[in-house]
């Protein structure tokens, strides 16, 4: 491993459509990928009238936008579906929205997912 890189071996898994898709709603996903590829965790969610609805969480693969990010932070301004990715085991357990704005001072809105969690 490269010094300073946080290896991702597993991520929080969550599927909002678990009943329809007949998977577990939540769990721990082992991340696999080619040795020359980096592995990440991600979270994706919607903000419905101020209420956070998690869509999916799990493993993400070799995306330069995720490199060396220890925290899962969405920086796009008001996306339809929020997405963040990070490196490090279970780094997607918590995620936040921190839009990069040119003029106004950015504000942080940390979000902690609250699905039931089972080992």
């Amino acid at each position: 491993a490269i010094l300073g890189r946080s290896e991702t071996q597993e991520c929080l898994f969550f599927n909002a459509n678990w009943e329809k898709d007949r998977t577990n709603q939540t769990g721990v996903e082992p991340c696999y990928g080619d040795k020359d590829k980096r592995r990440h965790c991600f979270a994706t969610w919607k903000n419905i009238s101020g209420s956070i609805e998690i869509v999916k969480q799990g493993c993400w693969l070799d995306d330069i936008n995720c490199y060396d990010r220890t925290d899962c932070v969405e920086k796009k301004d008001s996306p339809e579906v929020y997405f963040c990715c990070c490196e490090g085991n279970m780094c997607n357990e918590k995620f936040s929205y921190f839009p990069e704005m040119e003029v106004t001072q950015p504000t942080s809105n940390p979000v902690t997912p609250k699905p039931p969690y089972y080992n």
Epitope: E29, C59, W60, L61, F83
Partner: antibody, heavy 120, light 107 residues
Framework: QVQLVQSGAEVKKPGSSVKVSCKAS????????ISWVRQAPGQGLEWMGG????????NYAQKFQGRVTITADESTSTAYMELSSLRSEDTAVYYC?????????????WGQGTMVTVSS | EIVMTQSPSSLSASVGDTVTITCRAS??????LAWYQQKPGKAPRLLIY???QLHSGVPSRFSGSGSGTHFTLTISSLQPEDFATYFC?????????FGPGTKLEIK
Amino acid sequence: QVQLVQSGAEVKKPGSSVKVSCKASGPRFQDLSISWVRQAPGQGLEWMGGIIPIYGTANYAQKFQGRVTITADESTSTAYMELSSLRSEDTAVYYCVKDLTWTNLGLDIWGQGTMVTVSS
Amino acid sequence: EIVMTQSPSSLSASVGDTVTITCRASQGVSRWLAWYQQKPGKAPRLLIYGAGQLHSGVPSRFSGSGSGTHFTLTISSLQPEDFATYFCQQSYSTPFTFGPGTKLEIK
């Protein structure tokens, strides 16, 4: 590196069933996400359903609900797809495929395909 | 179910050309969009996952972009081995659905 090896071609009568197997070589079969995709001659690709062996339950495309059963045997690292009440329109190549992740980022490793011909 | 459309359905190009194939989803699929290449008699091959991530072993002349409902696959400096059929697929919501395909032929 995972490899998927499927069972051989089948010729079936209308109304009968077919069961196609897909043996995986490589580590941790139970953690894979396996899908089944079919392709009729000269046609496009159609996702039938999938399974994560560690969870055991499969999910199916509505079109095939009640007619398809996808299972996995962890002891032999083999996934199965059974399609019943066969009709001529089910003539196709059936592929088992591994997904990159449980959230289905992309179908990265494909079996060689199994040709199923339904004919009276 | 989410309906995927592709355009064009076929196109002719020459070695060295740059071509772009478009894929549209009937509803948003975020980044859950993959592109595949298929040659006659062969299984499809994954090219791009996550809308824009190049799969292992795929040449860098292939690139993908887009999110939501509109996606593109671009092949720059076409090589003889690139003439094939290309499919997009959404895996945001079951049933996962494929586009009808774009056949890329030699001019």
